[in-house]
Amino acid sequence: TQNKALPENIKYGIVLDAGSSHTSLYIYKWPAEKENDTGVVHQVEECRVKGPGISKYVQKVNEIGIYLTDCMERAREVIPRSQHQETPVYLGATAGMRLLRMESEELADRVLDVVERSLSNYPFDFQGARIITGQEEGAYGWITINYLLGKFSQKTRWFSIVPYETNNQETFGALDLGGASTQITFVPQNQTTESPDNALQFRLYGKDYNVYTHSFLCYGKDQALWQKLAKDIQVASNEILRDPCFHPGYKKVVNVSDLYKTPCTKRFEMTLPFQQFEIQGIGNYQQCHQSVLELFNTSYCPYSQCAFNGIFLPPLQGDFGAFSAFYFVMNFLNLTSEKVSQEKVTEMMKKFCSQPWEEIKTSYAGVKEKYLSEYCFSGTYILSLLLQGYHFTADSWEHIHFIGKIQGSDAGWTLGYMLNLTNMIPAEQPLSTPLSHSTYV
């Protein structure tokens, strides 16, 4: 048997991310005998479920089963049959379901109940569906990126796996942007916190981490847009909204009932003399930026320093990984390069937003118009959130790394969630075994 590797015992895990705008299924695998090592779990598949987020199925709960079928069947194909029964399946729902629960706990429970019944029909080890808290979402995102970057490993490497990985063990902060919420999580320089609600303590691989985290509900990119429209229509003189966040020549009719459907626009709700209004794009970055800033209340802060809306934010520290919609939007706009300064990003956004809608449609013919129309707003919103909301500066901008994947695994909360629920992140540093199962003998 000289130089023959013994067959590895591989384990699998499945996590469904039930986000506000869509659901994605992630399949992870790892060698069983190394499950307490850092960095051994990796993603083998992502399956995006066709359709919107599960909260939209509140009136059609009997369709949840077919909605999830293709991705669950894909998991059945990818994972060897012999492993099905021991493969855990977790579903975590985020801000879309948090908002539904705010409207009706009964309806949210009904959706989750049908989801659970549907997922229980598969041959996997279903571990439940739940709405995770914003704090969990932030914490698990932070764990994911630092796990994948090797920040919890005690072994120092002479090589770097990813361009922005340094050999130091300083953790990265995590910036996550979804459709309905956004999270900021990092280890501040000062260990003491003024706001216990935003403090988390972890002991991972023998090291203590005091982490700051906050999730801003209603400040995901989709809900922020609804907020902005609800705010701006208040002062419109008629049913035409000239909007600087959309390209010149862009037109779209919005139902007032849709605008006020979400709890996120409640603070702007008023009786309007029309049932519909038309957005008419004028494509002006500076004016769009000003409009977005009005969503952040910075006039009140009961702490030494705040982000916005009176929420404590300690001084920013170290490098940050910005993922999910931070990455998707900036990647579309071709602004993820480490070399692009904040000033250059702003300049590019000004240019992009001012381009006529017809020109944009021609340049990006393959992109669905619904998404295409919102990149000007989303890019502007990201800049406003990072600079004015979180107080990044032109200098600290270079510490933000827009990350889609790290070593083939998506940056996001799902991996951290699974690592935690499968007890794969030990509190203490595991003792290294002289020979692992896959060692050459």
């Epitope: 506000s20 705008s21 066709k50 359709g51 919107p52 909605y67 293709d70 069947e73 849709d258 669905k368």
Partner: nanobody, 124 residues
């Protein structure tokens, strides 16, 4: 615009079988979801069985193990094989073709086509 025409309904004794067909006038290859719904008198329309473009299926608990949905894209047809029929299966059966919208706003479905329905009566 896709038109759907159901056939195969009728009167059958309890324990008997029927095969419903749904012929589409357009190309169903591009339609992601095809399903059968039913509506009994005085009751809400309910989803019986559905099939995706990849051929994956899903059934209401009440028909699991008795009904089988299938699709033949070359014939632009969807079938519902109904075995071990019971009196409570009596209803008008409707064929439905749809796709979900990926959007967070507006309608859940991007498009939604329905047939006229075919009556199934299970009685001795």
């Amino acid at each position: 615009e896709v038109q759907l025409l159901e056939s195969g309904g009728g009167l059958v004794q309890p324990g008997g079988s029927l095969r419903l067909s749904c012929a589409a006038s357009g190309d169903i290859f591009s339609i992601n979801y095809m399903s059968w719904y039913r509506q009994a008198p005085g009751k809400e329309r309910e989803l019986v069985a559905a099939i995706t473009g990849r051929g994956n299926t899903n059934y209401a608990d009440s028909v699991k193990g008795r009904f089988t949905i299938s699709r033949d894209n070359s014939k632009n047809t969807v079938y519902l094989q109904m075995n071990s029929l019971r009196a409570e299966d009596t209803a008008v059966y409707y064929c439905n073709a749809w796709d979900y919208s990926d959007y967070d706003e507006g309608p859940l479905r991007e498009y939604d086509y329905w047939g006229q329905g075919t009556q199934v009566t299970v009685s001795s």
